[in-house]
Interface confidence: low
């Protein structure tokens, strides 16, 4: 009897299930939380997509708990955000805490759960569009007219507290054009645009984005008619062209007029240090440009020659107070590239401030929407603006004045000061990274042991940076290129202030023949340009040891007095034995260290590279 009842029950259940399945009645499909957004870090809303309803009425509920807490809660408000949403009011929103949430779908046949979503309010901010967009054509006298754009931040956002940093982007296009022209405005709430087509009607929009989070929608378009006479006065144009042409002509004439060594010293200021490539006089006379460039250290890295095979070198010292060290390329493109701008021309290498964690925004140390836990709850949505040509990392852009912090590939952040013309100091530092790298390793033939681990990478990237930089015109593009390619650990070398020392009457010119293995400089008198060909170096009778510095000539040539007794050579050797080299060095540098180790006072530390202070030598020789 019992068996019959049991079998009947089982049969009834199976029949019921079969009927349900035939009627298409199933448990609900798995829902998915696809998007969470906050307009202002004070409230936020999440939306989900229902799964299949199983052919039955389905109820959805969102439950959540906060990281580190065990209490489970249900969504406080299913209404405000519309269908399939959960809105968290101020009372339920907290910054810097992770919400772990899931959606439960239930019908008569059962229930299913979404995957858990990890949400940090900080990273889901999407502000409302900026307000009060005003556009105006400005036509100042004798200057190019421009479009002036102004706007206000969205009302929900309190910028005064510093709780929020908003970045803005402007886009504009002629009414009938297909493509938008996009300009990044940083934190400014106004912007000038110069390059516009006269007689066209333009659409202008602006949007904003917090330091972390998403771009707002574009503001409603504002239309502006560009006048047909939106060009500079013809006379102004012609005057500009004429002046420019005159300047170019003068430069060419001057360059052609100057010959030989004087031309070289003007165009390529001397670089300090004992192992700097000079020029063979033959090169200048015969005009072998390739060899000349090679001598200037312009060849590719790494060096192929041993130090013994180097060209004849000159020891040159800069005695001017206001002229800083510059690498040989520095005048080729002084206006290009990133210029690290410092208000004080101090003697700090800048390295410390590159690495100092206190200088970097704390935000930079936060996870970049931590891929393991914070999946982007908008993966299914199309990007809002596929036409946008660049993406600003939501993580690491934090404007302080006009110095943004950019993400440099890893979790570190790099500080790259933007070019700020108003602050440019007459004694500004190196013009680009390549120059720094080339100075750091010395001439191409010199061993490159200065650079730290990451600094070595800078050498590889310096060529690409140089070639990329030369074509860049706007700050924005510079910023973008550095955003993507700069290396945090590239050392910034700042030039030392020169110690002035008195120059005496010139006695002789000298050439460094070589650095002996025992550490002494082998020097020989240099023939004057007009006295015919110089004697070939290497002839024994010409090799003299010099030990006294008499003075420095006007054009920064170090003048040494021959010492027949060569007493000081021994002194060099003695002091060399006592002074350990400051860096791991190869043979050439050890020899060089012997020479430079005369006195600890005679070294100027520059980002790890040793420089000779001629003032010191003057004292030690006398």
């Amino acid at each position: 009897m019992k068996e019959n009842v049991a079998s009947a029950t089982v049969f009834t259940l199976l029949l019921f299930l079969n009927t349900c399945l035939l009627n298409g009645q199933l448990p609900p499909g798995k829902p998915e939380i696809f998007k969470c957004r906050s307009p202002n870090k004070e409230t936020f809303t999440c939306w989900w997509r229902p799964g299949t309803d199983g052919g039955l009425p389905t109820n959805y509920s969102l439950t959540y708990h906060r990281e580190g807490e065990t209490l489970m809660h249900e969504c406080p408000d299913y209404i405000t955000g519309g269908p399939n949403s959960c809105h968290f009011g101020k009372q339920y929103t907290s910054m810097w805490r992770t919400y772990i949430m899931m959606v439960n779908a239930t019908n008569q046949m059962g229930s299913s759960f979404s995957d858990e979503l990890y949400v940090d309010v900080t990273y889901i901010v999407q502000p409302d569009p900026p307000l009060e967009l005003a556009v105006e054509v400005k036509q100042p006298e004798d200057r190019k007219p421009y479009l002036w754009i102004k706007w206000s931040p969205p009302t929900l956002i309190d910028l005064k507290t510093g709780w929020f940093t908003l970045l803005y982007e402007i886009r504009l296009k002629p009414e009938k054009a297909a493509e938008w022209e996009i300009h990044f405005a940083g934190q400014q709430t106004e912007f000038k645009i110069l390059s516009l087509h006269p007689g066209q009607k333009y659409l202008v929009q602006v949007r904003c984005k917090p330091d972390h989070g998403y771009w707002s929608a574009w503001s409603p378009a504002t239309f502006i008619q560009i006048p047909s006479d939106f060009t500079m006065n013809d006379t102004t144009v012609w005057i500009s062209v004429a002046v420019l042409s005159a300047v170019i002509c003068l430069i060419i004439v001057w360059a052609v007029a100057l010959k030989g060594y004087s031309m070289v010293t003007c165009i390529f200021p001397p670089v300090p240090g004992p192992k700097i490539k000079g020029f063979d006089a033959h090169l200048l006379e015969k005009g072998k440009s390739e060899e000349l460039l090679s001598a200037l250290g312009c060849q590719d890295f790494p060096p192929t020659s041993d130090y013994e095979d180097l060209l004849v070198e000159y020891l040159e010292v800069d005695d001017s107070e206001d002229q800083h060290l510059m690498s040989v390329h520095s005048k080729e493109h002084p206006s290009q590239g990133m210029k690290p701008t410092y208000l004080d021309p101090d003697t700090d290498s800048g390295r410390g401030s590159c690495d100092s964690p206190s200088l970097l925004s704390e935000k930079c140390e936060e996870p970049q929407a931590n891929p393991s836990t914070f999946y982007d709850p908008e993966v299914i949505e199309k990007p809002e603006n596929p036409e946008t040509t660049h993406t600003w990392d939501p993580q690491c852009i934090s404007m302080e004045g006009k110095i943004p912090y950019f993400h440099a590939g890893g979790s570190k952040c790099s500080t790259w000061p933007l070019p700020q013309p108003s602050q440019h100091n007459p004694r500004s530092s190196y013009h680009n990274i390549t120059d720094v790298c080339e100075l750091a390793v010395g001439p191409a033939g010199a061993p490159a042991t200065l650079l730290n681990e990451a600094g070595k990478d800078a050498l590889k990237s310096s060529q690409t940076i140089k070639s990329r930089e030369e074509g860049k015109a706007t700050q924005q593009r510079e910023v973008e290129s550095f955003h993507s390619e700069t290396d945090q650990d590239t050392p910034w070398l700042l030039p030392q202030e020169k110690t002035p020392f008195g120059s005496a009457k010139p006695l002789d010119y000298v050439e460094i023949h070589k650095v002996n293995k025992d550490g002494a400089l082998s020097l020989l008198p240099k023939q004057r340009e007009n006295s015919g060909k110089p004697k070939k170096p290497g002839t024994p009778e010409n090799n003299k040891e010099y030990a006294k510095v008499s003075g420095v000539m006007d054009n920064n040539i170090l003048v040494l007095v021959p010492d027949p007794h060569a007493k000081n050579v021994a002194c060099f050797e003695e002091s060399a034995k006592e002074a350990p080299p400051s860096l791991e060095q190869n043979q050439a540098e050890k020899a060089l260290a012997n020479f430079t180790a005369t006195s600890s006072k005679c070294r100027l530390q520059l980002g790890g590279l040793d420089y000779l202070d001629p003032a010191c030598f003057t004292h030690s020789f006398h």
Partner: antibody, heavy 121, light 113 residues
């Protein structure tokens, strides 16, 4: 006027059933969680059950779990409490109360006048 | 479940005097993330339903006289009536709404001495 009015209370024998109703007016009923609270004669307040806003997720005190069922009809602005297997310990004044938010974890900012349920043989 | 314990069970205070009622929860009802205590105080007069006095442990409900104040955080809370009036005679209940079941304290009966 914002108010809650309970009904359906009365005398019932042990093991019997009763269905309480709470008619809401003066606010958007579906936007708020609703709660039943009871108070035995001369005793304190006891939270019985709650239901969330539009979705209708339900929560119960251990003492009534499996016997009581809370439900709501948002189209009628009415809250219900179906009470089965009643015992003498269920004798109490039953209050219907409105939560201040959509979910149940909110304070109760509006109370009905209550309906008395007496379980006695 | 979170257990709420009120003390004293009853309290007699002179008119115009200060009355203090305590409430202790077995677990913290403070959410550190939003710094809110999920605790409320109700007043129930004889023959009437309860009335909301204080929400979020210390926020007075609109229309409630300012002689009523709530304080405390975590597990220990206090309701204070700074100057007792005749109409304040009632039973006072605390309730936590941090975690279901949303439990009440057993109540404190306040009388005039």
């Amino acid at each position: 006027e914002v108010q809650l009015v309970e009904s359906g209370g009365g005398l019932v024998q042990p093991g019997g059933s009763l269905r309480l109703s709470c008619a809401a007016s003066g606010f958007t009923f579906s936007s708020y969680a609703m709660t039943w609270v009871r108070q035995a004669p001369g005793k304190g307040l006891e939270w019985v059950s709650a239901i969330t806003g539009s979705v209708g997720n339900t929560y119960y005190a251990d003492s009534v779990k499996g016997r009581f069922t809370i439900s709501r009809d948002n189209s009628k602005n009415t809250l219900y409490l179906q009470m089965n297997s009643l015992g003498a310990e269920d004798t109490a004044e039953y209050y219907c109360a409105k939560g201040a938010g959509m979910t149940t974890n909110w304070y109760l900012d509006l109370w009905g006048r209550g309906t008395l349920v007496t379980v006695s043989s | 479940d979170i257990v709420m314990t009120q003390s004293p069970d009853s309290l007699a205070v002179s008119l115009g005097a200060r009355a203090t009622i305590n409430c202790k929860s077995s677990q913290s009802v403070l959410y550190s993330s939003n710094n809110q205590n999920y605790l409320t105080w109700y007043q129930q007069k004889p023959g009437q339903p309860p009335k909301l006095l204080i929400k979020w442990a210390s926020t007075r409900e609109s229309g409630v006289p300012d002689r009523f104040s709530g304080s405390g955080s975590g597990t220990d809370f206090t309701l204070t009536i700074s100057s007792l009036q005749a109409e304040d005679v009632a039973v006072y209940y605390c309730q936590q709404y941090a975690s279901s079941p949303y439990t009440f304290g057993q109540g404190t009966k306040l009388e005039i001495k």
